[in-house]
C-alpha cells in the first residue's frame, strides 16, 4: 500500500507565440482545480477508461480576476498535494491524465459552471520510494509544470511497496537475508511468509511461498548444509556453528542498487545491472523508451530502444504533445484567408474558398469580368473578384456557350418524368409523390415525413469522469 503524490508547480501560458487568453475576467471571475487519473502499466490513454490505480480532485484555487489588457500570467493554484492512495503493489509503470478545470463564479443559475481548460497525458516508469520526478507538459498554448512521486505507507517498503518493515531486534545489523529499511535505518525488512518449514536461520524469500537458501545451505527448506569448501568466502571470520564463513561488510551490502537493480562487486567498488527503463550508477534514473511504444495516435518514436536513451515522438498532423496525445484544433489558427471556410480533415487541412478566391489557403484573388465575354446573351457577374456568367434561359457552362438540357441531370425524384419547358423544367410525379421535384411522399393520413429530432444531450461535468 502507498500513496501517489502530485504537486502542481504552475499552470500558465507556454513559450512561443500565440499566448492564450486568460480563462477568467472581471465579468466572469473563476478559479482552477485539477484532477488526476492513474492507470497501471502502459494502458490505453482514453480519458473515459477507468482510473484503475485511482483518481483525485484538488481543492479549488484562489479566485482570480483578469487584469484588463494584461497577458494571462501563471494562474493561482490550489494549496497542497493531490494524493492518490493505492492499496496493492505499486506497478512501477503507469499512465496518467492530469486535467485542469475552470470553475466560473459568475451569476450562473444553478451554481458554478465547470469547463475543462487543458488535459495532459503521459506514461512513465517510477519506483516507489524514489525522489520527486519533475515534468513539463503542454496542452495547446498552456503549459503545466508538476512533480510526482510514489511513496509506501509503513510498514510497506521497496520499489513496489511489497516488502514490510519492523523494528530492529539487534542494535547492529539485520538478520540473515534481511536489509535495513531505507530510509528508516533503525528498522529492518520483515521476513515475508515463506514456504512452510523454510529454515528461519538459513532460508529467506523474496516472494511469498518460496524458500531461497543462504550461501552454504541447500535443500527445499534450506536445512541441508553443503560441504564447507563451497561456502568459503574470501573475507570474514569463521563461524563455529556452521563451519562456514560469515561475510563481512562489502560494497554490495545493503544493495545500493535502486529499482530492483542487482549489485555485483568490482575490484574497486560495485556495479549495478538495472532493469529495463532504469539507468544511472545506482539505477536511480527512470525513463520510458521507444521499446515501450509511448507515442499515441500513430506517432513515430525516435530515440534508442535501450534504457539509457530518451525518446521523442514525431506526431502525425493534427496531434501534438510529448506523446502525440493532444489533438490540435488547427482551424483555430484561422489559416484560410479572404473569409475561406476551414475544414480539419484529420489527415489534412482544407480551405473552402469564397467565390473569387482560390489556392490552398484562398490566398489568390481571381480575375474579375474585365476582358471576359459571356456568350448567348449571358451577363458577367462580379462576385468577390470572380468571373461568373449568368446565362440566358437554355444556355449554360462557364461562358454560356453550352446549350442546356434542364432534364440532363435527372432532376425529378422517385421516378418522376422531366419535361423541358421555356421557363426551365417541369416534373410529372409518379403516383404517391408531390413537390416541384417530386421529392415529398404523399401520406394519406397527412402525417409528417420528417424524422423526429434527437433528444437533447446533458452537458458533462468533472464528477462523471471520476
Amino acid at each position: 500500500a502507498g500513496v501517489f503524490e502530485l504537486q502542481i508547480h504552475s499552470f500558465g501560458p507556454g513559450p512561443g507565440p500565440g499566448a492564450p487568453r486568460s480563462p477568467c475576467s472581471a465579468r466572469l471571475p473563476c478559479r482552477l482545480f485539477f484532477r488526476v487519473c492513474l492507470k497501471p502499466g502502459l494502458s490505453e490513454e482514453a480519458a473515459e477508461s477507468p482510473c484503475a490505480l485511482g483518481a483525485a480532485l484538488s481543492a479549488r484555487g484562489p479566485v482570480y480576476t483578469e487584469q484588463p489588457g494584461a497577458p494571462a500570467p501563471d494562474l493561482p493554484l490550489p494549496d497542497g498535494l493531490l494524493q492518490v492512495p493505492f492499496r496493492d503493489a505499486w506497478p512501477g509503470t503507469f499512465s496518467f491524465i492530469i486535467e485542469t478545470w475552470r470553475e466560473e463564479l459568475g451569476d450562473q443559475i444553478g451554481g458554478p459552471a465547470w469547463s475543462l481548460l487543458a488535459r495532459v497525458a503521459g506514461r512513465r516508469r517510477l519506483a516507489a520510494g524514489g525522489p520527486w520526478a519533475r515534468d513539463i507538459q503542454r496542452a495547446g498554448a498552456w503549459e503545466l509544470r508538476f512533480s510526482y512521486r510514489a511513496r509506501c505507507e509503513p510498514p510497506a517498503v521497496g520499489t513496489a511497496c511489497t516488502r514490510l518493515c519492523r523494528p530492529r531486534s539487534a542494535p547492529s545489523r539485520c538478520g540473515p537475508g534481511l536489509r535495513p529499511c531505507a530510509p528508516l535505518e533503525d528498522e529492518c525488512e520483515a521476513p515475508l511468509v515463506c514456504r512452510a518449514g523454510c529454515s528461519p536461520e538459513h532460508g529467506f524469500c523474496e516472494q511469498p511461498g518460496e524458500c531461497r537458501c543462504l550461501e552454504g545451505w541447500t535443500g527445499p527448506l534450506c536445512t541441508v548444509p553443503v560441504s564447507t569448501s563451497s561456502c568459503l568466502s574470501p573475507r570474514g571470520p569463521s563461524s563455529a556453528t556452521t563451519g562456514c564463513l560469515v561475510p563481512g561488510p562489502g560494497p554490495c551490502d545493503g544493495n545500493p542498487c535502486a529499482n530492483g537493480g542487482s549489485c555485483s562487486e568490482t575490484p574497486r567498488s560495485f556495479e549495478c545491472t538495472c532493469p529495463r527503463g532504469f539507468y544511472g550508477l545506482r539505477c536511480e534514473v527512470s525513463g520510458v523508451t521507444c521499446a515501450d511504444g509511448p507515442c499515441f495516435n500513430g506517432g513515430l518514436c525516435v530515440g534508442g530502444a535501450d534504457p539509457d536513451s530518451a525518446y521523442i515522438c514525431h506526431c502525425p498532423p493534427g496531434f501534438q504533445g510529448s506523446n502525440c496525445e493532444k489533438r490540435v484544433d488547427r482551424c483555430s489558427l484561422q489559416p484560410c484567408r479572404n473569409g475561406g471556410l476551414c475544414l480539419d480533415l484529420g489527415h489534412a487541412l482544407r480551405c473552402r474558398c469564397r467565390a473569387g478566391f482560390a489556392g490552398p489557403r484562398c490566398e489568390h484573388d481571381l480575375d474579375d469580368c474585365a476582358g471576359r465575354a459571356c456568350a448567348n446573351g449571358g451577363t458577367c457577374v462580379e462576385g468577390g473578384g470572380a468571373h461568373r456568367c449568368s446565362c440566358a434561359l437554355g444556355f449554360g457552362g462557364r461562358d454560356c456557350r453550352e446549350r442546356a438540357d434542364p432534364c440532363a441531370a435527372r432532376p425529378c425524384a422517385h421516378g418522376g418524368r422531366c419535361y423541358a419547358h421555356f421557363s426551365g423544367l417541369v416534373c410529372a410525379c409518379a403516383p404517391g409523390y408531390m413537390g416541384a421535384r417530386c421529392e415529398f411522399p404523399v401520406h394519406p393520413d397527412g402525417a409528417s415525413a420528417l424524422p423526429a429530432a434527437p433528444p437533447g444531450l446533458r452537458p458533462g461535468d468533472p464528477q462523471r469522469y471520476l
Epitope: 494502458s43 511504444g293 513515430l300 502525425p316
Partner: antibody, heavy 119, light 111 residues
C-alpha cells in the same frame, strides 16, 4: 494520384558522397506522411534508411546515423538523401517511399534508382 | 534492434494450392495500448518495387484480393494465400514498425 520519382547518379566512387533526389507529384510533402528512403541490396535484402516527416523532423537508422542526412525543398516538393563515405557495400537500388502514420505502413514506392559504388 | 526472420526462404507450388509462409520477430510487436501488432506484409514482383498487402498483422490493404490473409500476434506471424494464382509469383517480405522499421529476409514464391 501520388507519384514518387528517384533521380541521381548511377555510379559513385568509394569514399565520396551519394546524393539522390525524390520528386513528388500529386501531393504536398508538407501536408502529411513521413517520406522515407529504403534501399534494396543485390541479394534482395531491404533496409530502411530514414525518413523526413511532413513538418521536417527526421529519423535515421542507428547504423547509418553518422553518415546519413535527409533534407527537403518544399518549394520544389522534393526530398533528398545524402550518404557520406560510401563503400561498395552501399551498392543497391534506392527507393523513395511515403509512409502512413496511422497504419505505420510503407504505402507508395517510387520505381527505384540503381546506384553502384565503384572506382 | 528488432530482427525479423522469414521461412521458408523459397517455395514452389502449383496454381490453386494453399500457401503459408512464416515471419518471426526477435521481440513482441504487440502494442498493449493500441491493441495492434505493428507488422506488415509486402509483395515484390520481378522488376517492381514492393507493394503493401497487409498491415497491423491482419488488415488487408484496399484492393488486395481476399485470398491473401495475415494472422498471428506478438512474435509469430503468418501470411496465407488460399489459392495461389500465376500472378502471385513474387518475393514476400514482412516488416515491423513497432520501433523503427525492419524487413524480413523474404520468401520467394515460385509457381
Amino acid at each position: 494520384d501520388v507519384q514518387l520519382q528517384e533521380s541521381g547518379p548511377g555510379l559513385v566512387k568509394p569514399s565520396q558522397s551519394l546524393s539522390l533526389t525524390c520528386s513528388v507529384t500529386g501531393y504536398s510533402i508538407t501536408s502529411d506522411f513521413y517520406w522515407n528512403w529504403i534501399r534494396q541490396f543485390p541479394g534482395n535484402k531491404l533496409e530502411w534508411m530514414g525518413y523526413i516527416t511532413y513538418d521536417g523532423s527526421t529519423n535515421y537508422d542507428p547504423s547509418l546515423k553518422n553518415r546519413i542526412s535527409i533534407t527537403r525543398d518544399t518549394s520544389k516538393n522534393q526530398f533528398f538523401l545524402k550518404l557520406n563515405s560510401v563503400t561498395a557495400e552501399d551498392t543497391a537500388t534506392y527507393y523513395c517511399v511515403y509512409g502512413d502514420f496511422n497504419r505505420h505502413a510503407m504505402d507508395y514506392w517510387g520505381q527505384g534508382t540503381s546506384v553502384t559504388v565503384s572506382s | 534492434d528488432i530482427v525479423m526472420s522469414q521461412s521458408p526462404s523459397s517455395l514452389a507450388v502449383s496454381a490453386g494450392e494453399k500457401v503459408t509462409m512464416s515471419c518471426r520477430s526477435s521481440q513482441s510487436l504487440f502494442n498493449s495500448r493500441t491493441r495492434k501488432n505493428y507488422l506488415a506484409w509486402y509483395q515484390q514482383k520481378p522488376g517492381q518495387p514492393p507493394k503493401v498487402l497487409i498491415y497491423w498483422a491482419s488488415t488487408r490493404e484496399s484492393g488486395v484480393p481476399d485470398r491473401f490473409t495475415g494472422s498471428g500476434s506478438g512474435t509469430d506471424f503468418t501470411l496465407t494465400i488460399s489459392s495461389v494464382q500465376a500472378e502471385d509469383l513474387a518475393v514476400y517480405y514482412c516488416e515491423q514498425s513497432f520501433y523503427l522499421f525492419t524487413f524480413g529476409t523474404g520468401t520467394k514464391l515460385e509457381i
